[in-house]
Interface confidence: medium
């Protein structure tokens, strides 16, 4: 009976032990596709995350030649009405000009002396630019980048003056420190007697007969408003 | 003596951001603009962004633009350059450089700091 | 954007030759250009600004040319300390552009 009951329990043992090999491989075959499902699933995941970054930089992009697009068609509407009417009164910008704040800017991209970037402004019904807020000195700024760049400022025939008009002494003003200083150590002969934003935006005098950049602006008539979409 | 030191090298995953910093001295940190520009491994130098920390008013290269942010903590003389969603070809010597200017001529950078390795790999 | 073609690409040369490299650019850009030199595993070293003016503590071998849209850097007679890597840059407005460089080699 003894022997018996040993026999009954190798078999048992034989019986679990091929239960718990049985159990593990169908454990590890579980994990395995587990594995695999999870692998399948971040894959999946990053490919979703992917196109759907990819939409959304083409919704932007498409959104903002939507906006190109009825801003240009706005323009040339508005060109069209001028050309119709009378032209006495500038009810919007000029192609290829930026409207901000009911005036009109363009943005040169090449170098002339001071006297003929006021000159060209003048020939385009403009004037060199007159800034009169530090809000208006931000949009120039944004617009021209860190180079020297002419505005509508200049001691030519004594004090101060802008092209306008607008009166300098009550005026915004931002100069970089020590500035304006006329100075006359270039060897270029006599002082400096032309404004200028300088990389940082500053302000500085220097000698008119330098090349730099320009910005014309231009006043939209008070009364207009923005004409309707065709 | 005009100084930028840079931070030290680093090793990042792909999709990740870098910060590399420049400490400047010597010198009015506010009075001069900061640029950066990198080089690939044999590659040239290329232009990426250019802060002016009196004002924060910053520059980007077209190229970089909403991957890399230039910032500048006056209290420490010190400028960054972050650049996100880091992949292979971001690999290279990140430069910091002081722009230096005289009225009525152009612009320079004058001086530079030693460089920062960035290493992009899986 | 600005193009910048600098040429040569490489020169090789001996010590005391006249050594030139030109920087053509896509617009005028007066004279907003500058070089630099570079040695392996180091930053670049202002040479030249406002395109023809001597950076500080550079030797007088070195000088600059030009003005538009073309540049050049001469090495009057080079030295051994010359054989290094050369860039031109301009500032002519964002991006302040590289030439692509010029590699100065011992002949």
């Known amino acids: 009976q003894n022997s018996q009951l040993q026999e009954e329990l190798r078999g048992l043992r034989e019986t679990f032990s091929n239960f718990t090999a049985s159990t593990e491989a169908q454990v590890k075959g579980l994990s395995t596709q587990g594995g695999n499902v999870g692998r399948k699933m971040k894959s999946l995941e990053s490919q979703l995350e992917k196109q759907q970054k990819d939409l959304s930089e083409d919704h932007s992009s498409l959104l903002l030649h939507v906006k190109q697009f009825v801003s240009d068609l706005r323009s040339l509407s508005c060109q069209m009405a001028a050309l119709q009417g009378n032209g006495s009164e500038r009810t919007c910008c000029p192609v290829n000009w930026v409207e901000h704040e009911r005036s009109c800017y363009w943005f040169s991209r090449s170098g002339k002396a001071w006297a003929d970037a006021d000159n060209y402004c003048r020939l385009e019904d403009a004037h060199l630019v007159v800034v009169t807020s530090w809000e208006e000195q931000k949009f120039v700024q944004h617009h021209i980048g860190p180079v020297n760049t002419w505005m509508g400022l200049h001691d030519q025939n004594g004090p101060w003056k802008w092209v306008d008009g607008t009166d300098y002494e009550t005026g915004f003003k931002n100069w970089r420190p020590e500035q304006p200083d006329d100075w006359y150590g270039h060897g270029l002969g006599g002082g400096e007697d032309c404004a200028h934003f300088t990389d940082d935006g500053r302000w500085n005098d220097d000698v008119c007969q330098r090349p730099y950049r320009w910005v014309c602006e231009t006043e939209l008539d008070k009364a207009s408003q923005e004409p309707p979409l065709l | 003596e005009v100084q930028l030191v840079q931070s030290g090298a680093e090793v990042k995953k792909p999709g990740s951001s870098v910060k590399v910093s420049c400490k400047a001295s010597g010198y009015t940190f506010t009075a001069y603009g900061i640029n950066w520009v990198r080089q690939a491994p044999g590659q040239g130098l290329e232009w990426m962004g250019e802060?002016?920390?009196?004002?924060?008013?910053?520059f980007y290269a077209q190229k970089f633009q909403g991957r890399v942010t230039i910032t500048a903590d006056k209290s420490t003389s010190t400028a960054y350059m972050e650049l996100s969603s880091l992949r292979s070809e971001d690999t290279a010597v990140y430069y910091c450089a002081r722009k230096g200017r005289e009225y009525g001529t152009s612009h320079y950078f004058d001086y530079w700091g030693q460089g920062t390795t960035v290493t992009v790999s899986s | 954007d600005i193009q910048m073609t600098q040429s040569p690409s490489s020169l090789s040369a001996s010590v005391g030759d006249r050594v030139t490299i030109t920087c053509r650019i896509s617009?005028?850009?007066?004279?907003?250009l500058a070089w630099y030199q570079q040695k392996p595993g180091k930053a670049p070293k202002l040479l030249i600004y406002?395109?023809?003016n001597l950076a500080e503590g550079v030797p007088s071998r070195f000088s600059g040319s030009g003005s538009g849209t073309d540049f050049t850097l001469t090495i009057s007679s080079l030295q051994p300390e010359d054989f290094a890597t050369y860039y031109c840059?301009?500032?002519?407005?964002?991006?302040?552009?590289f030439g692509q460089g010029t590699k100065l080699e011992i002949k």
């Open positions: 406002a395109a023809i």
């Open positions: 617009e005028n850009i007066y004279s907003n």
């Open positions: 840059q301009h500032f002519w407005g964002t991006p302040f552009t």
């Open positions: 802060i002016f920390p009196r004002s924060d008013a910053t």
